[in-house]
């Protein structure tokens, strides 16, 4: 009989995750609710003990007896300033037992007190049970992860929690180390590598810098904010909508716990939606005093609401670099961990800080730590099946996969060397007013322009209702399964109408040799590709800005707010630029940028005058960062920033 598998557990502050390595690959295991992460919550009621989703779902009804954040207590003394500070924010009671903190709750009519290790052991028991339900046999061996900054006391307490849960803890490993293992960064064979792990979770933010040399991991520096995470972003949304509800309905819902809880759940859902779409809707029936609350929020507004929080994530990055005595150019790999790193703005800030460096994000960010822990568990169990050492070099997409957007640009949804299976979704839009359909052309390759890449297939999504350019939202999903079969789906979000294509390995795909040749060619052409990409990007930015400005001043809502002279000035300049663009599609980047700056010089003072004090966009609020445009024949699809 085959040896029982060992599991990897990411014991998180707000959510936990479990994975197992079997049949040559890691499987992240879903719980009985179908969720691949489980809330690190334990609730005590008059009749039962609840763990995970069930516990979190009833938190608003039973706050004093629902325990979370045990990770903030584990291995700490009661007098620890962290404990004293955190206690002020918890609805449950923390008591002092010989300078050890204990959580006091009412359970089955009695007062009970539990050590943090006991609470964590309950969460670990749940994770163990999730794995056992999936594997069909008892599990005892596990690798459990902890933050890199955890001291010996915190590590030992976590190990004790594992033992209490009936686990044989093979090893306690650092969360950033696990994430690096997940990406195979310990097996690149390229000598010493500096890896920065950016872990933005539900309630905590950790930055770690590791040096990996010949499979040896050394933590060089850690930094972060123990109270920054997805929940803070949810709070910003909740506050925003509480204020919106006040404005619309002249009622304050903030003191109604049930209404706020329902709003928070909707906000969390909206936040997740905004990572893949540029707009999210909230529909809450009878939110307060019988009033239905139907509203929406754009990604741009969400980014604005959280801008200071997002920007603040770079301070610990800088601190970690200083502490590690490294320059940002010396970081070889950037790894994203934690669900909040799905937020495009967070990714952009980090990528821009590192001057455009690629981010390792192909593994689900809230699963990366458990993934690495599962790999480590398999290694420690001496698993040689499918050669666990080479596991991570096997299942990758050998070339970037994407589609053609306006101007013949290759827009990659799945980057080369992404671990598969993987699924990526992006929102696109139309290029022309009243465009009835879009042509989805799927390519693989590393070149900037699709004409230099390999066409895998094409299909059309028709029946798009008439709308101005840039308004329709076409959701395109690239989904590669474990066998390398690619499914591309396009859905018009307004109608739900969809079309898809399936591309298998043997249909129009490239051989190993061709892939190798294309990779080498791509290196050779990188410089000229970059020039071309920048040129098209500058052209698209100019075109977008011109059309945005034109439609902005033509907006009926601005009647009486803008003088005819100013309106004419903007429209004349837009006309000049748009006509110039039509005649100069092959102009240089400098020329496009010059025209954009010229147009901004005319428009920005006029537009900003309209929005000063109006809560709308500030100077250049309709900015050059609008939908990217381009030229091309046929129904063109356009990327949405």
């Amino acid at each position: 009989m085959a040896k029982a598998a060992a599991i990897g557990i990411d014991l998180g502050t707000t959510y936990s995750c479990v994975g197992v390595f079997q049949h040559g690959k890691v499987e992240i295991i879903a719980n009985d609710q179908g969720n691949r992460t489980t809330p690190s919550y334990v609730a005590f009621t008059d009749t039962e003990r609840l763990i995970g989703d069930a516990a979190k779902n009833q938190v608003a009804l039973n706050p004093q007896n629902t325990v979370f954040d045990a990770k903030r207590l584990i291995g700490r003394k009661f007098g620890d300033p962290v404990v004293q500070s955190d206690m002020k924010h918890w609805p449950f009671q923390v008591i002092n037992d010989g300078d050890k903190p204990k959580v006091q709750v009412s359970y089955k009519g009695e007062t009970k007190a539990f050590y943090p290790e006991e609470i964590s052991s309950m969460v670990l028991t749940k994770m163990k049970e999730i794995a056992e339900a999936y594997l069909g046999y008892p599990v005892t061996n596990a690798v459990i992860t902890v933050p890199a900054y955890f001291n010996d006391s915190q590590r030992q307490a976590t190990k004790d929690a594992g033992v209490i849960a009936g686990l044989n803890v093979l090893r306690i490993i650092n969360e950033p180390t696990a994430a690096a293992i997940a990406y195979g960064l310990d097996r690149t064979g390229k000598g010493e590598r500096n890896v920065l792990i950016f872990d933005l979770g539900g309630g905590t933010f950790d930055v770690s810098i590791l040096t990996i040399d010949d499979g040896i991991f050394e933590v060089k520096a850690t930094a972060g904010d123990t109270h920054l995470g997805g929940e803070d972003f949810d709070n910003r949304l909740v506050n925003h909508f509480v204020e919106e509800f006040k404005r619309k309905h002249k009622k304050d819902i903030s003191q109604n716990k049930r209404a706020v809880r329902r709003l928070r759940t909707a906000c969390e859902r909206a936040k997740r939606t905004l990572s893949s779409s540029t707009q999210a809707s909230l529909e809450i029936d009878s939110l307060f005093e019988g009033i239905d609350f139907y509203t929406s929020i754009t990604r741009a507004r969400f980014e604005e609401l959280c801008s200071d929080l997002f920007r603040s994530t770079l301070e610990p990055v800088e601190k970690a670099l200083r502490d590690a005595k490294l320059d940002k150019a010396q970081i070889h790999d950037l790894v994203l961990v934690g669900g909040s790193t799905r937020i495009p703005k967070v990714q952009k800030l980090l990528q821009d800080f590192f001057n455009g460096r690629d981010l390792n994000k192909s593994i689900n960010p809230d699963e990366a730590v458990a993934y690495g822990a599962a790999v480590q568990a398999a290694i420690l169990m001496g698993d040689k099946s499918e050669n666990v050492q080479d596991l991570l070099l096997l299942d990758v997409a050998p070339l970037s996969l994407g589609l053609e957007t306006a101007g013949g640009v290759m827009t990659a949804l799945i980057k080369r060397n992404s671990t598969i299976p993987t699924k990526q979704t992006q929102i696109f839009t139309t290029y022309s007013d009243n465009q009835p359909g879009v042509l989805i052309q799927v390519y693989e390759g590393e070149r900037a322009m699709t004409k230099d890449n390999n066409l895998l297939g094409r299909f059309e999504l028709s029946g798009i209702p008439p709308a101005p350019r840039g308004v329709p939202q076409i959701e395109v999903t690239f989904d590669i399964d474990a066998n390398g079969i690619l499914n591309v789906t396009a859905t018009d979000k307004s109608t739900g109408k969809a079309n898809k294509i399936t591309i298998t390995n043997d249909k129009g795909r490239l051989s190993k040799e061709e892939i190798e040749r294309m990779v080498q060619e791509a290196e050779k052409y990188k410089a000229e590709d970059e020039v071309q990409r920048e040129r098209v990007s500058a052209k698209n930015a100019l075109e977008s800005y011109a059309f945005n400005m034109k439609s902005a001043v033509e907006d009926e809502g601005l009647k009486g707010k803008i003088s005819e002279a100013d309106k004419k000035k903007v429209l004349d300049k837009c006309q000049e630029v748009i006509s110039w663009l039509d005649a100069n599609t092959l102009a240089e980047k400098d020329e496009f940028e010059h025209k954009r700056k010229e147009l901004e010089q005319v428009c920005n003072p006029i537009i900003s005058g309209l929005y000063q004090g109006a809560g709308g966009p500030g100077p250049g609020g309709f900015g050059a960062q609008g939908p990217k445009g381009g030229s091309g024949s046929g129904p063109t699809i356009e990327e949405v920033d």
């Epitope: 006509s579 010089q601 920005n604």
Partner: antibody, heavy 116, light 112 residues
């Protein structure tokens, strides 16, 4: 009335830097771009580039990329042109010129002499 | 980049006579949407800053005497001074703003 007043003549040694200022008055500074034009002794006009006074984004002509920097201080309605690593062939009169759709108002020019 | 070639380099004309200056562009300066040619003319007197005379090929800047006129389209443009006056002695430059900006080499106008 609209005026662009430039800083006085400068004499510099090769390798040094110079910063020419151009103070605008009589109009809203951030509503119009500011161009810089060079005229070497006995030569024609050369467009160096311009700065978007609203966003602060500069544009440099090909021959003026690298050692030249355009900046603005909107609080004083002043545009600046800095030139580093001066060479003898940088000796010229430097003009600032307001730009709407044409260069309609010009500064009086600043003579920069580079001599060892 | 667009190159503007002015001719002649210098020109001596009697007072009251007509002076004609040409400016040839390496590419068309006509924007078909606005139907404008993005060419301007500047006058620079000795020791002074340049002064705008004409923009969009033929539109006179306010305060410029009507003896100055501009014409042309596409790549060929002309500045005409109908009846030369003593105060018209200067160097005249054409400038394009179709894409980025460039000046012509200048034409020196003197009294014969």
């Amino acid at each position: 009335q609209i005026q662009l007043v430039q800083s006085g003549a400068e004499v510099k040694k090769p390798g040094a830097s110079v910063k020419v200022s151009c103070k605008a008055s009589g109009y809203t500074f951030t509503n119009y771009g500011m161009n810089w034009v060079r005229q070497a002794p006995g030569q024609g006009l050369e467009w160096m580039g311009w700065i978007n006074t609203y966003t602060g984004e500069p544009t440099y002509a090909d021959d003026f990329k690298g050692r030249f920097t355009f900046t603005t201080d909107t609080s004083t309605s002043t545009a600046y042109m800095e030139l580093r690593s001066l060479r003898s062939d940088d000796t010229a009169v430097y003009f600032c010129a307001r730009y709407d759709h044409v260069m309609d108002y010009w500064g009086q020019g600043t003579l920069v002499t580079v001599s060892s | 980049e667009i190159v503007l070639t002015q001719s002649p380099d210098s020109l001596a004309v009697s007072l009251g006579e007509r002076a004609t200056i040409n400016c040839k562009s390496s590419q068309s300066l006509l924007n078909s949407g606005t139907r404008k040619n993005y060419l301007a003319w500047y006058q620079q007197k000795a020791g002074q800053s340049p002064k705008l005379l004409i923009y969009w090929t033929s539109t006179r800047e306010s305060g410029v005497p009507d003896r100055f006129s501009g014409s042309g389209s596409g790549t060929d443009f002309t500045l005409t001074i109908d009846s030369l006056q003593a105060e018209d002695v200067a160097v005249y430059y054409c400038k394009q703003s179709y894409t980025l900006y460039t000046f012509g080499g200048g034409t020196k106008v003197e009294i014969k």
